[in-house]
């Protein structure tokens, strides 16, 4: 097991609707085939796992059909996306990206983007 | 080094509940994280859930969250994975381990763990 470093942005701002999206880059040492990304999410002292995804360079990200994020990949850059959002899910995205095959594998762990989610206002009844 | 003895293992029903222990001794404070793992036959060693020693952070896997937690005692240097709700699938030896670096934690890789036990068995009938 081999260790590689992750790149991934500090802070990121929902926007109004729950959608968060940041790159995670990874130093690739050679030339991956299959890539694995992994979210985890760390808040009040738990870490837990919000979506993942294999996927051959070149091709695009498939999450499974419930997870909340989606994603495409670039070179060593996978954009990622997470929907569904709620004020309830600040916390701390960490990003986990596996060099599957060939080998030798490596792993990476980004040091994560805090995603702050602040819920809309709900709109004052109108007089009109 | 670090040594590490697991206990608590044994034959339980389906449904039931189980508390497994590490206790820990050496040099503990060397290591970042503490890790539970399990191997069935002919399986990889899997990962079930890790807690940070600098401030009790816990990692569960979607794969048992909710009827996994992992817990620790600093008093007694000693980790502890409460099972509960048993399936027959969670047959298997169970290994706790010592992570040296902050990839251990997270990971959830058997390869980025150094010290290990020498596991507890644990079998769940149904």
């Known amino acids: 097991c081999k260790a590689m470093h992750v790149a991934q942005p500090a802070v990121v701002l929902a926007s109004s609707r729950g959608i968060a999206s940041f790159v995670c880059e990874y130093a690739s040492p050679g030339k991956a085939t299959e890539v694995r990304v992994t979210v985890l999410r760390q808040a009040d002292s738990q870490v837990t796992e919000v979506c993942a995804a294999t996927y051959m360079m070149g091709n695009e990200l498939t999450f499974l059909d419930d997870s909340i994020c989606t994603g495409t990949s670039s070179g060593n850059q996978v954009n990622l996306t997470i929907q569904g959002l709620r004020a309830m899910d600040t916390g701390l995205y960490i990003c986990k990206v596996e060099l599957m095959y060939p080998p030798p594998y490596y792993l990476g762990i980004g040091n994560g983007t805090q995603i702050y989610v602040i819920d809309p206002e709900p709109c004052p009844d109108s007089d009109f | 080094q670090v040594q590490l003895v697991e206990s608590g293992g044994g034959l339980v029903q389906a449904g039931g509940s189980l508390r497994l222990s590490c206790a820990a001794s050496?040099?503990?404070?060397?290591?970042?994280?503490m890790g539970w793992f399990r191997q069935a036959p002919g399986m990889e060693r899997e990962f079930v859930a890790s807690?940070?020693?600098?401030?009790?952070?816990?990692y569960v896997p979607n794969s048992v969250k909710g009827r996994f937690t992992i817990s620790r005692d600093n008093a007694k240097n000693t980790v502890y994975l409460q099972m509960n709700t048993l399936k027959p699938e969670d047959t298997a030896v169970y290994y706790c381990?010592?992570?040296?670096?902050?990839?251990?934690?997270?990971?959830?890789?058997?390869?980025?763990?150094?010290?290990w036990g020498q596991g507890t068995l644990v079998t769940v009938s149904s």
């Open positions: 381990a010592t992570g040296p670096t902050r990839l251990s934690f997270y990971s959830g890789n058997y390869r980025t763990y150094d010290s």
């Open positions: 807690i940070r020693w600098s401030d009790n952070t816990t």
């Open positions: 050496g040099r503990t404070f060397s290591s970042y994280a």
